[in-house]
């Protein structure tokens, strides 16, 4: 008579998280008398995850009725699947004995892996605006995904970039892991309006990737552009000297009027005209009395930009 | 007769996280009379998945009807699969035995390897904004993806990047697997508007990737080129200087007019022009009381922006 | 619904002999071990042994090893436990369970002379 | 046989204090086979943990098991009125199966 065997016909079983995981478990004899127990993992550390006759394992239900009449087949089902089920198991046949059963044959085990949805990846750009032509950093973070296969791409505007670092964490076997990744991405003035994507593709987003954005306005300071001209004006004793500031991001502006490097005024930029890359423009204007000096006068526009350090322009105003 | 053999026909299954696996046992004969187990792993540490006859494995359910006379098969399902799961399965047979039963025979196991969608993937930029032409770092990372096996890409703009670095963690094996990838991006000028954008594909993907996008805007500086210009002027005694500001970004920015190196009038920045690449223009003008000034005057336009050293631009203004 | 029903409470004269039944529904005790606990007045829990109702195959602490007799009767999906040789200090309510999760009611068994 | 020592024998302690229960094992125990189980005046045990850390359905979340080897703990985070009971713990690793004497959780 053959001896008992204990057949696992899969080797592995992949399942989603949430989803219930059969393992599959068959028998080819009735003999010897004894319970069937399912295991995760092997030796004295094994974890019983059903046990036929006692016990309280409510995720698990057998896929066949195992007490009716010469049943062979031991299949489980287990709910609700985790990151944490994963592991390789076991179906053994004890043989009934004094005082305890004895443990007779197992199966060769059936690792199951779950896979696991990537969290939303979350982009976050630098704590510091930097200036184009800089390269600023941005990160990429997705959590609790299975198995470790995971793929990540990073875009600026739809184009994809090459300058960044990835890291898949733990390194070692994990029930779910997270990935981390690095971009630099090196700014022109054009960026206002700009956005990087990170797009994380999973086994278990079936093609349809995750991605998360970042703005690269909340990275980008476009220092602004100054031109001080001279209006006409009617009035014979009177100057008007203007001050055009051009294209800055983010909004943030204070312009200080400067006669002869003298403060005359001080304008926080209030009404902005949008430029339709993202960058502003102002004018602020000083109203000089021309008979109030004898000689010729520098009047200097000078702006401090979201809190960098000044820059300024000069114009020399003629007194004839 | 013929020994009892446990077939396990699949080496292998793989299932989507929160889906079932059916994990495939089927026994060559009823003799020996006995219970099967499904185990998790081989070995002491091995752990048990399904009981025949006592225990509560609730995502366990068999097939076919275990009892029904003659069974051989004896396949499970495991529901809400999710990466912990992921292990070799093994459909073990015991003999009943005094005083316990003893194992009998074990398929040969069946490997469940879980696929996990990767997690959105999460794009963060430099915490410091760059200016053009220089190089800044996004990261990209996305979790809990499963298998291993994953692509990244980068993108600026719909330009694929070719500077970067990816991981994918951990380097052994695991339920779930982390991405973490740094991409190196050289800003220009006119990255105001651009985007990265990280692109992951994964197996469970089905061919559509998931996308995660930062905005170079946020993490460009552009600095403004400053032109101090005189304007006509109708009265004689007046002149009007203006510096305009352009191509900054970002927005804030703060002017300073200097009269022959004297603060004559700081403005912030309000209302800015937009340029079509993002930037922002801005002018201020200084209007200069030629009266008030003997000799020639040096106006300057000293621009500070983002919080950057101020850059400036003088103009002679000629007293005649 | 699980549900295990105890017999009545008993009386018995010490070197008595009593025997309790646990009749179970929602399930066949086939599909189970049933198991026996004794409580004592005021005491914590004793395991007394179980039964295979499949097979009929009995498991027995040492402490009751020879008096206890568990049987099974699957045609009525009933279990049953028979004290014998009965002493004061067997007087406890004794729990029939169902593979250590579901429990019958308790019967109260009083020794005394 | 495994003997199962549970300590303390009486905990007095007030709603919204965290109890301990300890059970430690003559000889190791395979964390799959320790269950706990919950026991009012006058009706039958009703299991309260499975399999060292798993709280049975209905179970309040402020219950945790936990432990591995010889020594095992039940934790009640924030004690409420209902909480107070007879604890035991309970091994079914091998025959014979054998039950803690009990902790009796009291209102101080």
């Known amino acids: 008579e053959d001896e008992l065997q204990v057949i696992q016909p899969e080797k592995s079983v992949s399942v989603a998280a949430g989803e219930s995981a059969t393992l599959r478990c068959a028998m080819t004899s009735l003999i010897p008398v004894g319970p069937i127990m399912w295991f995760r993992g092997a030796g004295a550390g094994r974890e019983l995850i059903y046990n036929q006759k006692e016990g309280h394992f409510p995720r698990v239900t057998t896929v066949s009725e195992l007490t009716k009449r010469n049943n062979l087949d031991f299949s489980i089902s287990i709910s609700n699947i985790t990151p944490a089920d994963a592991g390789t198991y076991y179906c053994v046949k004890f043989r009934k004995g004094s005082p305890d059963d004895v443990e007779f044959k197992s199966g060769a085990g059936t690792e199951l892996s779950v896979r696991a949805k990537p969290s939303a990846p979350v982009v976050s750009g630098p704590a510091v605006r930097a200036t184009p032509e800089h390269t600023v950093s941005f990160t990429c973070e997705s959590h609790g995904f299975s198995p470790r296969d995971i793929t990540l791409k990073w875009f600026k505007n739809g184009n994809e970039l090459s300058d960044f670092q990835t890291n898949v964490d733990p390194a070692g076997d994990s029930v779910s892991y997270s990935i981390h990744s690095t971009a630099r991405v090196v700014l022109t003035r054009g960026d206002v309006h700009s956005q990087v994507i990170c797009e994380i593709a999973h086994i278990t987003l079936q093609g349809d990737p995750l991605r998360g954005t970042a703005n690269l306005s909340e990275a980008i300071r476009v220092p602004p552009t100054l031109e001080v001209t001279q209006q006409p004006m009617r009035a014979e004793n009177q100057a008007n000297v203007t001050c055009q500031v051009s294209n800055f991001y983010p909004r943030g502006l204070q312009l200080t009027w400067l006669e002869n490097g003298n403060v005359s005024r001080t304008e926080t930029a209030s009404t902005l005209i949008e430029n339709k890359d993202g960058t502003y423009n102002w004018m602020s204007w000083l109203l000089v009395n021309t008979c109030a000096h004898r000689d010729d006068v520098v009047l200097t526009c000078q702006v401090e930009h979201d809190g960098q350090q000044a820059v300024s322009k000069s114009y020399a105003l003629e007194i004839s | 007769e013929d020994e009892l053999q446990v077939i396990q026909p699949e080496k292998s299954v793989s299932v989507a996280a929160g889906e079932s696996a059916t994990l495939r046992c089927a026994m060559t004969s009823l003799i020996p009379v006995g219970p099967i187990m499904w185990f998790r792993g081989a070995g002491a540490g091995r752990e048990l998945i399904y009981n025949q006859k006592e225990g509560h494995f609730p995502r366990v359910t068999t097939v076919s009807e275990l009892t029904k006379r003659n069974n051989l098969d004896f396949s499970i399902s495991i529901s809400n699969i999710t990466p912990a799961d992921a292990g070799t399965y093994y459909c073990v047979k015991f003999r009943k035995g005094s005083p316990d039963d003893v194992e009998f025979k074990s398929g040969a196991g069946t490997e469940l390897s879980v696929r996990a969608k990767p997690s959105a993937p999460v794009v963060s930029g430099p915490a410091v904004r760059a200016t053009p032409e220089h190089t800044v770092s996004f990261t990209c990372e996305s979790h809990g993806f499963s298998p291993r096996d994953i692509t990244l890409k980068w993108f600026k703009n719909g330009n694929e990047l070719s500077d970067f670095q990816t991981n994918v963690d951990p380097a052994g094996d695991s339920v779930s697997y982390s991405i973490h990838s740094t991409a190196r991006v050289v800003l220009t000028r006119g990255d105001v508007h651009s985007q990265v954008i990280c692109e992951i594909a994964h197996i469970t993907l089905q061919g559509d990737p998931l996308r995660g996008t930062a905005n170079l805007s946020e993490a460009i500086r552009v600095p403004p080129t400053l032109e101090v210009t005189q304007q006509p002027m109708r009265a004689e005694n007046q002149a009007n200087v203006t510096c305009q500001v352009s191509n900054f970004y970002p927005r804030g920015l703060q002017l300073t007019w200097l009269e022959n190196g004297n603060v004559s009038r700081t403005e912030t920045a309000s209302t800015l022009i937009e340029n079509k690449d993002g930037t922002y223009n801005w002018m201020s003008w200084l209007l200069v009381n030629t009266c008030a000034h003997r000799d020639d005057v040096v106006l300057t336009c000293q621009v500070e922006h983002d919080g950057q050293q101020a850059v400036s631009k003088s103009y002679a203004l000629e007293i005649s | 619904e699980v549900q295990l029903v105890q017999s009545g409470a008993e009386v018995k004269k010490p070197g008595a002999t009593v025997k309790i039944s646990c009749k179970a529904s929602?399930?066949?005790?086939?599909?189970?071990?049933m198991h026996w606990v004794q409580q004592a007045p005021g005491k914590g829990l004793e395991w007394i042994g179980r039964?295979?109702?499949?097979?009929?195959?009995?498991k027995y602490a040492p402490k009751f090893q020879g008096r206890v007799t568990i049987t099974a009767d699957t045609s009525t999906n009933t279990a049953y436990m028979e004290l014998s040789s009965l002493r004061s200090e067997d007087t406890a309510v004794y729990y029939c369970?169902?593979?250590?999760?579901?429990w019958g009611q308790g019967t109260l068994v009083t020794v005394s002379s | 046989e495994i003997v199962l020592t549970q300590s303390p024998a009486t905990l007095s302690l007030s709603p919204g204090e965290r109890a301990t229960l300890s059970c430690s094992a003559s000889?190791?125990?395979?964390?799959?086979?320790l269950y706990w189980y919950q026991q009012k005046p006058g009706q039958a045990p009703k299991l309260w943990i499975y399999?060292?850390?798993n709280l049975a359905s209905g179970i309040p979340a402020r219950f945790s098991g936990s432990g591995s080897g010889t020594d095992y703990t039940l934790t009640i985070s924030s004690l409420e009125p209902e909480d107070f009971a007879v604890y035991y713990c309970?091994?079914?690793?091998?025959?014979?199966?054998?039950f803690g004497q009990g902790t009796k959780l009291e209102i101080k």
């Open positions: 369970d169902r593979g250590l999760a579901y």
């Open positions: 929602g399930f066949n005790i086939k599909d189970y071990y």
């Open positions: 000889s190791s125990v395979s964390s799959s086979y």
């Open positions: 399999s060292t850390s």
């Open positions: 309970h091994q079914w690793s091998s025959y014979p199966y054998t």
């Open positions: 039964i295979d109702p499949e097979d009929a195959e009995t």
